[in-house]
């Protein structure tokens, strides 16, 4: 796609004024840039900046969406992009709440089938290739605002109207309560709130912790799993290696995680996905006569 | 359904400048790039650049850069380019297009659908 | 800037026939490719775009294939109303740019 896009755009997010604020949050600096008499002041952090073309990237995925998807074609994409940007724009980035994504999660709810939701942990590519492939499965990358936001980076500046495009807040070296952590727990918390039935995780296999506490799944969507609705949480480890044959629901990690999900009154599956290649392959096409087997 | 509806056909002459206009109708306007696309006798199509009304944000290509302004008016669904200096190897038919999204892991891919019916731009002397 | 060569420039066909219209990448684009038909004096439209996907209310008798660096447009049965001018378009990098043409005529 068009990542590597002209430095020539016309495209101005700075009409805001430019103050300095003596409040630090987290372990940001603040550095002068621009030159001049009068410096202009920057608040500097440890992760990335902002997507380069971020609001223009917000509103055609936004457009896209509503176009493929016609329950959602009453939605305004002008209103979704005032919304978005009105949830992080002129505040400072390690202050944003649930509360500022309010107005964004208004306009952007969607009914899902609450019983063909997809969770995933540190297995993202497979658990969307499996949906493109099942398509009356959900992971949250498949509704409109886990579609926005994926992979996508942004942040404001306190009291300016700017975009920052050199570096925003990194949940763990400066804050957690910034605009991109905030949303995605904001979303999450939602999107598991919702769910019913038999609820799917896919987790990887090839990872020290298959089951982290400290992963959106783990500190988010498990606690927020209605016991009153979600009959069952069945997880699918997937295998890394061609040749590992062992039985990856027996991992300390878990048992970890059937105990918290036992705890909440929801009864609690695993299966070993041995091949994921092949798996997507079956899923494709169930008639394959080698996919009577174990995968 | 989206129509685009351009403006007539000119004739300038050589160093003088030419405002297209293409109005929309039936869609959302303002949340959709309009582009630029001009076809010269016996050459290629040839993408200008576009407009995203929403923000009001223009992106030239390079060898354009400097003699193209696109504009929009949201109150009247109506975009336009303007094409400063003319000369004679300006002359081609000038098309407005909506741009489609397609797919593309991080920003969709750019088609045009629909075009205008384009504006043929006449520069002699 | 990413350069489309459009082959063969012309393409004699009757109707019935199959039609293969050939777009080349100067570099590989993936999947980031369109296909347009103009017939004279109209403006391009829309035939396939992301390198296989039929645009809304072509025939099926147009498809599309390739990535990378290759791709093809196939009419798989020519109509009257098919011989036209087409033209490819790549999506993958800026500035956006488009092929030669490749001009189906009537044998």
């Known amino acids: 796609g068009l990542n590597d896009i002209f430095e020539a755009q016309k495209i101005e997010w700075h009409e805001g004024s430019h103050h300095h604020h003596h409040h630090h949050h987290g372990s940001g600096s603040l550095v002068p840039r621009g030159s001049g008499s009068v410096p202009r002041w920057r608040q500097q952090w440890s992760g990335p900046g902002t997507t380069k073309r971020f609001p223009e990237t917000v509103l055609a995925r936004c457009v896209k969406y509503t176009e493929i998807h016609p329950e959602m074609r009453h939605v305004d994409c002008q209103s979704v992009w005032d919304a978005f940007k009105g949830a992080f724009i002129s505040k400072h980035p390690c202050n944003i709440t649930e509360e500022d994504y309010q107005p964004l999660m208004k306009l952007g709810t969607q009914t899902v089938p609450c019983n063909k939701i997809l969770l995933w942990s540190r297995i993202k590519d497979l658990a969307h290739q499996f949906t493109q492939v099942q398509r009356d499965m959900f992971t949250l990358e498949d509704t409109l605002l886990g579609y926005l936001a994926d992979d996508l980076t942004w942040c404001g500046e306190f009291n300016t109207s700017k975009i920052n495009y050199q570096s925003c807040p990194d949940w763990r070296k400066d804050c957690s309560n910034n605009p991109v952590s905030v949303f995605w727990k904001t979303v999450s918390r939602r999107f598991a709130e919702a769910a019913c039935d038999v609820v799917h995780v896919m987790l990887n296999g090839s990872r020290s912790k298959i089951f982290d506490k400290n992963s959106t799944f783990g500190s988010v969507e498990v606690h927020n799993l209605q016991p009153e609705k979600v009959q069952t949480l069945e997880a699918w480890v997937i295998h890394g290696g061609r040749e590992d044959s062992r039985d990856l629901c027996q991992d300390p990690t878990i048992k970890e995680l059937e105990s918290i999900i036992s705890k909440r009154n929801i009864q609690f599956s695993c299966k070993n996905i041995y091949r994921p290649d092949k798996f997507l392959q079956c899923v494709k096409n169930p008639e394959d006569s080698s996919c009577t087997s174990e995968i | 359904q989206v129509q685009l509806v351009q403006s007539g056909a000119e004739v300038k002459k050589p160093g003088s400048s030419v405002k297209v206009s293409c109005k929309a109708s039936?869609?959302?306007?303002?949340?959709?790039?309009i582009s630029w696309v001009r076809q010269a006798p016996g050459k290629r199509l040839e993408w200008m650049g576009w407009i995203i009304p929403i923000f009001g944000t223009t992106t030239y290509v390079q060898k354009f850069q400097g003699r193209v302004t696109i504009t929009a008016d949201e109150s009247t669904s109506t975009a336009y380019m303007e094409l400063s200096s003319l000369r004679s190897e300006d002359t081609a038919v000038y098309y407005c297009?909506?741009?489609?999204?397609?797919?593309?892991?991080?920003?969709?891919?750019?088609?045009?659908?629909?075009w205008g019916q384009g504006t043929l731009v006449t520069v002699s002397s | 800037e990413i350069v489309l060569t459009q082959s063969p420039a012309t393409l004699s066909a009757s109707p019935g026939e199959r039609a293969t219209l050939s777009c080349r990448a100067s570099q590989s684009i993936s999947s980031n490719l369109a296909w347009y038909q103009q017939k004279p004096g109209q403006a391009p439209r829309l035939l396939i775009q992301d390198s296989s996907t039929r645009a809304t209310g072509i025939p099926a008798r147009f498809s599309g294939s390739g990535s990378g660096t290759e791709f093809t447009l196939t009419i798989s049965s020519l109509q009257s109303e098919d011989f036209a001018v087409y033209y490819c378009?790549?999506?993958?990098?800026?500035?956006?740019?488009f092929g030669g043409g490749t001009k189906v005529d009537i044998k």
């Open positions: 039936g869609g959302n306007f303002i949340s959709y790039s």
């Open positions: 297009a909506r741009v489609k999204y397609g797919s593309g892991s991080y920003y969709p891919n750019n088609w045009f659908d629909p």
């Open positions: 378009q790549q999506s993958d990098n800026w500035p956006l740019t």
